[in-house]
Amino acid sequence: QSPPGKPEIHKCRSPDKETFTCWWNPGSDGGLPTNYSLTYSKEGEKNTYECPDYKTSGPNSCFFSKQYTSIWKIYIITVNATNEMGSSTSDPLYVDVTYIVEPEPPRNLTLEVKQLKDKKTYLWVKWLPPTITDVKTGWFTMEYEIRLKSEEADEWEIHFTGHQTQFKVFDLYPGQKYLVQTRCKPDHGYWSRWGQEKSIEIPNDFTLKD
């Protein structure tokens, strides 16, 4: 039996700059029941506060709701582990909410096979930004990637589309079924997970409809 090992705050993420969660790895418990508490202060402030919500984001986590989230201030966060033999504290982590955004994936993915005047066919992929991000006001500048592969293929083909919410894919094989997904990343943050998969078959004998 011994004091607890040093915990580590290993990840903080925000879906929208309005709320965020930090998770920690507990470290060893020294063979004893161990309590964990997350405390934080904000830049320029002397006061220290305890985590407002240990439940919402699951075990070993702290959720900061809108009421507790500010993008104007740096959060200085530590986790303390305590058992009857002693305590230990994580290294402090400095968190700027601007830099931890991992948005939801883009939505409303639509796939359409089109044809140019020269009879060349292409797949027109369109999507919308995630619901919660106010892209129009410039609050978020979002970049996108799409990936696609034929059902038989092992490897995805990835296309970076910049700020565009549509993309044309050429040189696809007629008669093949293709799977497509999109993801997005804010200017300073992390890529979202890949969104819902959509599929479309490229016709063998595509003719332009009026």
């Epitope: 993008i71 968190v95 700027d96 601007t98 830099y99 890529w191």
Partner: antibody, heavy 118, light 112 residues
């Protein structure tokens, strides 16, 4: 505690390339971006670029595109920077540096001195 | 790229005096999120830089309160209220509002 270990020095020939390493320990490697910074002897600091170890996404200073390539090996918690077509202008100390979830450098490696000489 | 101009290049001081280092940026360092990402680092010979001040005026963990930062927009200052022997080192300002992040040329604090 957080540590970033870099070899002390590399002596290389002009026109060749070198791969610098930065072994991270004391934290979850894939959770924090890794930056690289150049310092020529007696001069200021230049930001080369950054890599997100969780998915190898990179962002380079335009000046170093084509010169530096950043990669990671997550299984060994090591970040790498490959420098190509070396000239005397590339002789410098190269640091790896980690921020927290912020845009400044909280932790630095000790730096690797690269000397390009015939 | 944002050019960071530090003055003076070298600053002779007496121990116990106040030292003041200036840093000017070629464009405003106010980020679209309202924050100003101007930081100060200290570097000792043969060592890597260490963070002193982040976001203009916030002392990093363990930094003595004789160090203070101020300024806004494009003009910033690092002040050391009572210079001690261990402060006679190289100081850099740095901006991370705009990519690429850039640094000042450095100011060497030395004994008068």
């Amino acid at each position: 505690q957080v540590q970033l270990q870099q070899p002390g020095a590399e002596l290389v020939r002009p026109g060749t390339s070198v791969k610098l390493s930065c072994k991270a320990s004391g934290y979850t490697f894939t959770s924090f971006w890794m930056h690289w910074v150049k310092q020529r002897p007696g001069q200021g600091l230049e930001w080369i670029g950054v890599i997100d170890p969780s998915d190898s996404h990179t962002n380079y200073n335009q000046k170093f595109k084509g010169k530096a390539t950043l990669t990671v090996n997550t299984s060994s918690s090591t970040a790498y920077m490959h420098l190509s077509s070396l000239t005397s202008e590339d002789s410098a100390v190269y640091y790896c540096a980690r921020g927290d979830y912020s845009n400044w450098f909280t932790y630095w490696g000790q730096g690797t001195l690269v000397t390009v000489s015939a | 790229d944002v050019v960071m101009t530090q003055t003076p290049f070298s600053l002779p001081v007496s121990l116990g005096d106040q030292a003041s280092i200036s840093c000017r940026s070629s464009q405003s360092l106010v980020h679209s999120n309202g924050n100003t990402y101007l930081h100060w680092y200290l570097q000792k010979p043969g060592q890597s830089p260490k963070l002193l001040i982040y976001k203009v005026s916030n002392r990093f963990s363990g930094v003595p309160d004789r160090f203070s930062g101020s300024g806004s927009g494009t003009d910033f200052t690092l002040k050391i209220s009572r210079v001690e022997a261990e402060d006679l080192e190289l100081y850099f300002c740095s901006q991370s509002t705009h990519v690429p992040w850039t640094f000042g040329g450095g100011t060497k604090l030395e004994i008068k």
